[in-house]
């Protein structure tokens, strides 16, 4: 199809090599008086959609994206060309950065119901640099954290740097939605609930003398609680001894609680005691079982191909450590009898 | 530096219509949002609205309707269209440049409209 | 419909005075935070004194600061300047931004 009459906006995704990102575009299709399709639920350009910025068809995903070649060959479907980029609803996701996304993405509605509809798509020119070590030395973090039931705020990475009376208008989007009435650098939240979680991205323009682009950054906002005071605990075993049978095989499973921590290492391990000598076991790799904003539940299992007369005059422990300490549960093993 | 100066404000007969005018300087109407907000003599402040970047406008309940705000990018211009001018009109209007919703972070010094027959 | 009310309209202040401004709102300010606090001096423009309800603006004087949330909120100034005397607004931001607007003023003179 002709790309000719496409609305075309620029975009620009500066990146920062320390770390991973991700980045979106939206098929913002046009405000227009033009095409059914594109209506927006009827909202006259002067007002604002709540919901999406994408209006444009009652089915979201019944949109298609390409890219365009630099080199003037056909466009290319994105789903089947692009497996780095992923398609949900009418957002485009990249989930790497690099300079080979530079590009041209075009989006248009599938379903072409009349010879107006053609018209209605929109070009997004897309430029992907990697950040400049001139640039601000501690820009915002593209994962941020809020901490559950106190104040916090999201920051803009790209426009971290600058105060809040310089920083030009910023338009937010939360997961898609526009937040219409937060227009600056920073989302200052007044009490964090787990709603405030999600992907965030911030958008504003930059100008100069030839034409004006917007620059994008994406945000991952997780909620957390504060990090644990405690050490964890062992949820099991819980006694002392276990009553094995003499050349069956075994497997004792420790089960430890870690509180939440913000730098989570969790350290989850068996070790033997015979005598006076100790030795860590090679065994299964740990498992979270249960996860939840306040703690994860670990698991580690040792396991023995048969049990032996040896290893009832042995201990069998279980050491567990968080930032806080550690702690220890050792077993007995002990045969049954009759 | 950031400056920003009101002009177009005269005595006019209730009834008409009249457009402010607030050039900008040392900043782009394309990266900032813009506001409008009068004082009758003697009175306080109210908040008439606000023009985003994009364009997008929103006005105080009292102002839709009669009152429109504009913008000229390339002109560095913003525009406030008043029309069926009443005598309660009669105020210094002001532009801000507005971050956020709120705050009016730098004002124009003002231009002052009297609407009287 | 939105009622923004300042107390008290006027206050007689001395230099060295600390001097406590009220605002409330209702409904609730968007996000609980979204207050501002103006300075108006006459033949001039308004001034941004504090925004999000207690940041203090660029090259604001410490004496000045504002505390609360949601509908209560506080404009304080510890220790009266002769500069001080002025009127204040207190300025809310809500979710239908076509709602946003101003306190009634308070006027603080000279006693």
């Known amino acids: 199809f002709n790309i000719s009459g496409c609305s075309t906006k620029k975009l620009l995704w500066t990146y920062s090599t320390r770390s991973e990102e991700e980045f979106v575009l939206f098929c913002d299709l046009p405000e227009p008086q033009k095409s059914h399709f594109c209506h927006r639920n009827r909202l006259s350009p002067k007002q604002v959609p709540e919901h999406l910025p994408f209006m444009g068809s009652n089915d979201l995903s019944d949109v298609q994206w390409y890219q365009q070649p630099s080199n003037g060959d056909p466009l290319e479907d994105i789903r089947k060309s692009y497996p780095h980029i992923i398609q949900d609803k009418c957002t485009l996701h990249f989930l790497t950065p690099g300079v080979n996304n530079s590009g041209s993405y075009i989006c248009r509605p599938k379903m072409i119901k009349s010879p107006y509809d053609v018209a209605c798509c929109v070009k997004m020119i897309l430029e992907v640099k990697p950040q400049t070590n001139a640039s601000c030395e501690y820009s915002a973090s593209h994962k941020q954290d809020l901490l559950l039931g106190s104040t916090g705020s999201i920051s803009c990475p790209s426009l971290s740097c600058q105060s809040d009376a310089q920083s030009p208008a910023v338009t937010w989007y939360k997961n898609g939605k526009l937040l219409s009435v937060e227009r600056s650098n920073r989302i200052v939240v007044d009490e964090v609930y787990d709603y405030h979680q999600g992907t965030y991205v911030c958008d504003y323009t930059q100008s100069d003398t030839v034409s004006s682009w917007t620059v994008r950054a994406v945000v991952q906002v997780r909620t957390i609680v504060g990090d644990t005071k405690l050490k964890p605990d062992i949820l099991d075993p819980v006694e002392d001894t276990l009553e094995v049978e003499l050349g069956k095989p075994l497997t004792i499973s420790c089960k430890a609680r870690f509180g939440f921590e913000r730098v989570f290492n969790p350290v989850i391990k068996w070790y033997i005691k015979d005598s006076d000598l100790e030795w860590e076991v090679s065994v299964p790799e740990a498992k979270s079982i249960k996860s939840t904003l306040k703690d994860e539940i670990i698991e580690r299992n040792i396991i023995l191909e048969k049990v032996t007369q040896r290893d009832l005059r042995r201990k069998f422990v279980c050491f567990v450590q968080n930032s806080i300490g550690n702690t220890t549960q050792s077993v007995q093993l002990k045969e049954k009898r009759g | 530096e950031v400056q920003l100066e009101e002009s177009g404000g005269r005595l006019v007969q209730p009834g008409t219509s009249l457009r402010l005018s607030c050039a900008v300087s040392g900043f782009s109407l394309n990266s900032y949002d813009m506001s409008w907000v009068r004082q009758a003599p003697g009175k306080g402040l109210e908040y008439v609205g606000i023009?985003?970047?994009?364009?997008?406008?929103y006005y105080a309940n009292w102002a839709k309707g009669r009152f429109t705000i504009s913008k000229d990018t390339s002109k560095t211009t913003l525009y406030l269209q008043m029309n069926s001018l009443r005598a309660e009109d009669t105020a210094t209007y002001f532009c801000a440049r507005t971050h956020n919703t709120l705050p009016f972070y730098i004002w124009g010094q003002g231009t002052l409209v009297t609407v009287s027959s | 419909d939105i009622v923004m009310t300042q107390s008290p309209s006027s206050l007689s202040a001395s230099v060295g005075d600390r001097v406590t401004i009220t605002c409330q709102s209702s409904p609730s300010v968007y996000n609980n935070n979204r207050l501002s606090w103006f300075q108006q001096k006459p033949g001039q423009a308004p001034k941004l004194l504090i925004y999000?309800?207690?940041t203090l603006a660029s090259g604001v004087p410490s004496r000045f600061s504002g505390s609360g949330s949601g509908t209560d909120f506080t404009l304080t100034i510890s220790s009266l300047q002769p500069e001080d005397f002025a009127t204040y607004y207190c300025a809310g931001g809500y979710s239908s931004i076509s709602d946003n607007g101003f306190g009634q003023g308070t006027k603080v003179v000279i006693k």
């Open positions: 999000y309800a207690s």
């Open positions: 023009i985003y970047n994009s364009g997008t406008t």
